[in-house]
């Protein structure tokens, strides 16, 4: 069964910078990746970035840079411009559309006790929804 993993990490040098890492574990080729925050895409979440292997990427503030790390994983750098850090309590979700499997989505957040530079364990928290 395909799985999606999500890691959220705070940068050690800049406490206002976060990076979301997402990956797809399974067969098939990735046709689209959507990163949202505040909940799953289409279920109360707001798209932060969309990555397509051919069409390119689109991102919206506070996303700073979205890029492919491998053919089945991506990273999204976030810049927190506020004085406090809302990202610390925010859920980030990644949805991978894969042919012919369908869509798979998981969510993650920065662990409350995590130190700067440490990331969340790569434990998938699957949302059981395959389109």
């Amino acid at each position: 069964t395909p799985e999606v993993w999500v890691q959220v990490q705070m940068e050690a040098t800049e406490l206002s910078s976060f990076t979301v890492h997402c990956g797809f574990l399974g067969p098939g080729s990735i046709s689209l990746v959507t990163v949202s925050w505040g909940g799953p895409d289409g279920a109360g979440g707001t798209k932060l970035a969309v990555l397509h292997p051919e069409l390119g990427t689109r991102q919206w503030a506070p996303a700073r840079q979205a890029r492919w790390e491998t053919q089945s994983s991506i990273s999204l750098a976030l810049e927190d411009s506020g004085a406090s850090s809302p990202f610390a309590n925010t859920t980030f979700c990644c949805k991978f559309a894969s042919f012919p499997e369908g869509s798979w989505e998981s969510c993650g957040s920065l662990p409350p006790s995590s130190d700067p530079g440490l990331s969340a364990p790569p434990t998938p928290v699957p949302i059981l929804r395959a389109d």
Epitope: S31, L32, G39, T46, H52, L55, G102
Partner: nanobody
């Protein structure tokens, strides 16, 4: 709940121009559809696709409007525009905005899978 609101319709002489706008709004979050599209329906006729634009900026147009109509989206991703030039009487119709998400981010053919629709804005072109 997602709502689409169109504006910019009106009456114009043949050869004139109009710019339609559509804004997608949602309760509690920002909705950025993969695909936003314009459709139109003239009295007594079936609804037809006019133009579509995906989240990456890729556009498709009906043959009848190519070279005259231009679809665009704002940088924030939730507004859709339609610049209509060299309008003809046969462009008279109610124009509807539609939006939805597709598996690959592109606009599906003929608007299939666009599950949100606006109430429409009337465009009347007189000769």
């Amino acid at each position: 709940h997602v709502q689409l609101v169109e504006s910019g319709g009106g009456s114009v002489q043949a050869g004139g121009s109009l710019r339609l706008s559509c804004v997608a709004s949602a309760s509690g979050f920002t909705y950025r559809p993969y695909c936003m599209a314009w459709f139109r329906q003239a009295p007594g006729k079936e609804r037809e696709a006019v133009a579509g634009i995906d989240i990456f900026g890729g556009t498709t147009y009906a043959d009848s409007v190519k070279g005259r109509f231009t679809a665009s989206r704002d940088n924030a991703g939730f507004s859709l525009f339609l610049q209509m030039n060299d309008l003809k009487p046969e462009d008279t119709a109610m124009y509807y905005c539609a939006a939805g998400d597709s598996p690959d981010g592109r606009c599906p053919p003929l608007g299939q899978g666009l599950n949100y629709w606006g109430q429409g804005t009337q465009v009347t072109v007189s000769s």
